[in-house]
C-alpha cells in the first residue's frame, strides 16, 4: 500500500468506503421510489490525518493550515472521489419507470 | 438566493469560500517555491446543515442518515466544488520556471 493509504490511527479509523443498510424511509424517498425498498448505501467515512489519501494539493494546504490554525481551518474531510450508478424504480405520470442515478453511491474515497 | 443558499445558522456560519493569508512557511513550500512568498488561499469552511448547498443526491442521503445515526454517519462536509488555477515560480534543476497548479485554490463550495 502507498504511504497515503496506511492509516496511522489504526485499522478502519481513516477515510474509507463504508456500507450502510438503509430503508427508503431512512432516506426520505418512501413516497417517490417503489423499489428496491432497501438499499446498501456506500459512503465515505473516517478521519483524514496528514498525507492520508490526499485528493490534491489543496488538501495538503488545508492540512498544513489546520495544523497552524486548528480553530480557523478544519482538517481535510473524507468525501467520494467517484460514484457508482444506481437504479431506482419510480412512479411516473404514465406508470412506472427504471431510472438511473449517477451520484448516489460512493465508489471510492479521498480527503479534501 | 436559492433556499439551499440561505444559512439557517446565521450569516457566515455555513459552508462558504474563505480567504486565509498564508506564508510559504505556513504551507510547507518554502524550500521549493520562490514566489510569491505569501498566498491568499481560498478554501471552503463552514457547517453543512440540511439542504444547504447539497452537491448531489449522495449529500441528501448522507444528511438523512446522519440525522438517524449521528454516531455512525457524519454530516456532509464543506469542500470545493471547483478550483481556480494559480501560478507559482519554482526552482528547477536548470533554474527557475513558472508552473500552473489547477487544484490549489477553491473557487466555490458545496456540501458532500
Amino acid at each position: 500500500a502507498r504511504n497515503g493509504d496506511r492509516c496511522p490511527l489504526g485499522p478502519g479509523r481513516c477515510c474509507r468506503l463504508h456500507t450502510v443498510h438503509a430503508s427508503l424511509e431512512d432516506l426520505g424517498w418512501a413516497d417517490w421510489v417503489l423499489s428496491p425498498r432497501e438499499v446498501q448505501v456506500t459512503m465515505c467515512i473516517g478521519a483524514c490525518p496528514s498525507q492520508f489519501r490526499e485528493a490534491n494539493m489543496h488538501a495538503q494546504i488545508k492540512m498544513n493550515l489546520h495544523r497552524l490554525k486548528p480553530d480557523t481551518v478544519p482538517a481535510p474531510c473524507c468525501v467520494p472521489a467517484s460514484y457508482n450508478p444506481m437504479v431506482l424504480i419510480q412512479k411516473t405520470d404514465t406508470g412506472v419507470s427504471l431510472q438511473t442515478y449517477d451520484d448516489l453511491l460512493a465508489k471510492d474515497c479521498h480527503c479534501v | 438566493a436559492r433556499n439551499g443558499d440561505r444559512c439557517p445558522l446565521g450569516p457566515g456560519r455555513c459552508c462558504r469560500l474563505h480567504t486565509v493569508h498564508a506564508s510559504l512557511e505556513d504551507l510547507g513550500w518554502a524550500d521549493w517555491v520562490l514566489s510569491p512568498r505569501e498566498v491568499q488561499v481560498t478554501m471552503c469552511i463552514g457547517a453543512c446543515p440540511s439542504q444547504f448547498r447539497e452537491a448531489n443526491m449522495h449529500a441528501q442521503i448522507k444528511m438523512n442518515l446522519h440525522r438517524l445515526k449521528p454516531d455512525t454517519v457524519p454530516a456532509p462536509c464543506c469542500v470545493p466544488a471547483s478550483y481556480n488555477p494559480m501560478v507559482l515560480i519554482q526552482k528547477t534543476d536548470t533554474g527557475v520556471s513558472l508552473q500552473t497548479y489547477d487544484d490549489l485554490l477553491a473557487k466555490d463550495c458545496h456540501c458532500v
Epitope: S35, P85, M86, V87, G95, L98 | -
Partner: antibody, heavy 119, light 107 residues
C-alpha cells in the same frame, strides 16, 4: 436463504386462463419487485412484466397487455401471474424472478412452471 | 423497446478454451447489463450484473466488461460444467429485454 418456489405444472385448453403462484422466503417480500419471464420450448427468454410487492404497481410487456394480470399477497409473501385467453403459443415454462435491485440485478429465480396449452 | 443482439448464437469449444460472447444494445444502457447461464431444464442463473460485477458464488473465470451499447462475457478457461446457454439482459428501462442466447457446446 432467498428462495422463490412456484406452483406445479398446468395443462390448459385454448381460451382458458392459468394462474401461477410464486412464494418468496428468506427476505422481506415487500423490499423487491417480482418479474415474470417465460420460455417457449427450445426458445429464448421473454420478459412478461414486473410487479412491486410493496404497492402493487405493475409494468407489463406491450404484447401481453390486456391478457396478463400480476398480483401479490403480502400476508403470504406470494406473487401471482394470471394469463387469460390462452393460445397454443403460450405453451412455455413460466419463471418468477426477484428484482431489479439497486444494480439492476434480477438475482433469484423460481424453478419454473410448465404451462401446456393444448386442445 | 431496446433490442439486445447476442453473438455468436452458438460456439463449439474445448475444456480449457477461452470463450468470448458479445452482446449489443440498440441504444445506450449505461452499465445495466446482466449475464445468465442456463442449463437444460433449469432456471437461469445470474453470473454478472452491472456489466462487470461478479455475482456472489460465481467462479472468477467468468468476467464481464463494456458499457453503453457493447458488452462482453468472457470465460477464461472453460470447464465441463460451463457447457450451457448464456443470455444477456438489459434493465436500463422497461420493458426488460434479453438477448437471443449463445449455446456453448463441446467441440
Amino acid at each position: 436463504q432467498v428462495q422463490l418456489v412456484q406452483s406445479g405444472a398446468e395443462v390448459k385448453k385454448p381460451g382458458a386462463s392459468v394462474k401461477v403462484s410464486c412464494k418468496a422466503s428468506g427476505y422481506t417480500f415487500t423490499s423487491y419487485g417480482i418479474n415474470w419471464v417465460r420460455q417457449a420450448p427450445g426458445q429464448g427468454l421473454e420478459w412478461m412484466g414486473w410487479i412491486t410487492a410493496y404497492s402493487g404497481d405493475t409494468n407489463y410487456a406491450q404484447k401481453l397487455q390486456g391478457r396478463v394480470t400480476m398480483t401479490t399477497d403480502t400476508s403470504t409473501s406470494t406473487a401471482y401471474m394470471e394469463l387469460r385467453s390462452l393460445r397454443s403459443d403460450d405453451t412455455a415454462v413460466y419463471y418468477c424472478a426477484r428484482g431489479p435491485g439497486q444494480y439492476a440485478d434480477v438475482d433469484v429465480w423460481g424453478q419454473g412452471t410448465m404451462v401446456t396449452v393444448s386442445s | 423497446d431496446i433490442q439486445m443482439t447476442q453473438s455468436p448464437s452458438s460456439v463449439s469449444a474445448s475444456v480449457g478454451d477461452r470463450v468470448t460472447i458479445t452482446c449489443r444494445a440498440s441504444q445506450g444502457i449505461s452499465s445495466w447489463l446482466a449475464w445468465y447461464q442456463q442449463k437444460p431444464g433449469k432456471a437461469p442463473k445470474l453470473l454478472i450484473y452491472a456489466a462487470s460485477s461478479l455475482q456472489s458464488g460465481v467462479p472468477s473465470r467468468f468476467s464481464g466488461s463494456g458499457s453503453g451499447t457493447d458488452f462482453t462475457l468472457t470465460i477464461s478457461s472453460l470447464q465441463p460444467e460451463d457447457f450451457a446457454t448464456y443470455y444477456c439482459q438489459q434493465a436500463s428501462q422497461f420493458p426488460i429485454t434479453f438477448g437471443g442466447g449463445t449455446k456453448v457446446e463441446i467441440k
